[in-house]
């Protein structure tokens, strides 16, 4: 799918929409550029609008092509390749390993979701950037750290 950049000319799949709400029902209007893109491009995890608005306020579907049990969603166990089943899990805070004063403020899964929606022209954000989920812990790439905790879900 072609991605619209701020200076790009609309492709055959994209059409200029001069004002808000001027796209036909089969199209989605990019917020900043006003371009109309196919509705099927909305929430497909590809950033087609230059401002990423086609990927904002999307319901996080765990595992794009696989139906997983609902009980696997937000259970602290990443089952999807992109860990999407553990994203957008409410206001559970992810407590970074190590000294929180040196790690900065806690990251929440909601902020990760926002970050994914705000990221321009990159892959979806995965939990690689998130230290832990629930009682799970993260072992940083290349190191041999890791704290012994049992799995669990924060209620």
């Amino acid at each position: 799918e072609a991605a619209a950049s701020p200076l790009s000319t609309p492709t055959s799949a994209q059409a200029a929409g001069p004002s808000s709400g001027s796209c036909p029902p089969t199209k989605f209007q990019c917020r900043t550029s006003g371009l109309c893109v196919p509705l099927t491009w909305r929430c497909d995890r590809d950033l087609d609008c230059s401002d990423g608005s086609d990927e904002e306020e999307c319901r996080i579907e765990p595992c794009s092509d696989d139906c997983i049990p609902l009980t696997w969603r937000c259970d602290g166990h990443p089952d999807c390749p992109d860990s999407s089943d553990e994203l957008g899990c409410g206001t559970n805070e992810i407590l970074p390993e190590g000294d929180a004063t040196t790690m900065g403020p806690p990251v929440t899964l909601e902020s990760v979701t926002s970050l994914r929606n705000a990221t321009t022209m990159g892959p979806p954000v995965t939990l690689e950037s998130v230290p832990s989920v629930g009682n799970a812990t993260s072992s940083s790439a290349g190191d041999q750290s890791g704290s012994p905790t049992a799995y669990g879900v924060i209620a």
Partner: antibody
Framework: DVQLQESGPDLVKPSQSLSITCTVT?????????WHWIRQFPGNKLEWMGY???????NYNPSLKSRISITRDTSKNQFFLHLSSMTNEDTATYYC????????????WGAGTTVTVSS | DIVMTQSPSSLTVTAGEKVTMSCKSS????????????LTWYQQKPGQPPKLLIY???TRKSGVPDRFTGSGSGTDFTLTISSVQAEDLAVYYC?????????FGAGTKLELK
């Protein structure tokens, strides 16, 4: 094809710690998948121990409480099992294994390494 | 934790015989959303790691002979070997792959008469 190979000590003394390495070839452990440890006791009982996900997330069997840690060295494409306070009951064959994506069963296994706990 | 109970613990069979073994789970493994049973069967021969045979209770892994059939739903599952071959002599394990911690049955050992 992805291959897993365990390496570690044959013998560990009681109260000591165990460290086992799983070397992965044919696939990057940071690409995706979760990378698990399962052990099999002399009576053939199988126990799931825990995993490290490609993202670095780890999860453990609560039965192992605070004794277990799974870490990795991405530069060597290896992940490790650390088990502290070993007792005779930890004598087992230790397997590293990997489930297919979006599943919780196991289709790729290492050959296993047998660890005996004895003084 | 989900407890997996296999029976019998051992079976003595003759080549060509039909064999069934049971696996019961202490909690249901059927997901109502996708109607899949999260129950897996493995075969293990001496000196080897377990080998995946059947997943989702009844789906044979590619390359597994069709004499192996998995059936059942909810909490009661069965592995059937329609005509036992010498190479089938092994220990068979079932696994809960629905809920962590993942748990295994104690196994059913298939022996030759």
């Amino acid at each position: 094809d992805v291959q897993l190979q365990e390496s570690g000590p044959d013998l560990v003394k009681p109260s000591q710690s165990l460290s086992i390495t799983c070397t992965v070839t044919g696939y990057s452990i940071t690409s995706d998948y979760s990378w698990h440890w399962i052990r099999q006791f002399p009576g053939n009982k199988l126990e799931w121990m825990g995993y490290i996900h490609s993202s670095g997330i780890t999860n453990y069997n609560p039965s192992l409480k605070s004794r277990i840690s799974i870490t990795r060295d991405t530069s060597k494409n290896q992940f490790f099992l650390h088990l502290s306070s070993m007792t005779n009951e930890d004598t087992a064959t230790y397997y590293c294994t990997r489930p297919p994506v979006v599943t919780r069963y196991f289709d790729v296994w290492g050959a296993g390494t047998t660890v005996t706990v004895s003084s | 934790d989900i407890v997996m109970t296999q029976s019998p613990s051992s079976l003595t069979v003759t080549a060509g015989e039909k064999v069934t073994m049971s696996c019961k789970s202490s909690q249901g493994l059927l997901d109502s959303g996708n109607q899949k049973n999260y129950l897996t069967w493995y075969q293990q021969k001496p000196g080897q790691p377990p080998k995946l045979l059947i997943y989702w209770a009844s789906t044979r892994k590619s390359g597994v002979p069709d004499r192996f059939t998995g059936s059942g739903s909810g909490t009661d599952f069965t592995l059937t070997i329609s005509s036992v071959q010498a190479e089938d002599l092994a220990v068979y394990y079932c696994q809960n792959d629905y809920t962590y911690p993942l748990t295994f049955g104690a196994g059913t050992k298939l022996e030759l008469k």
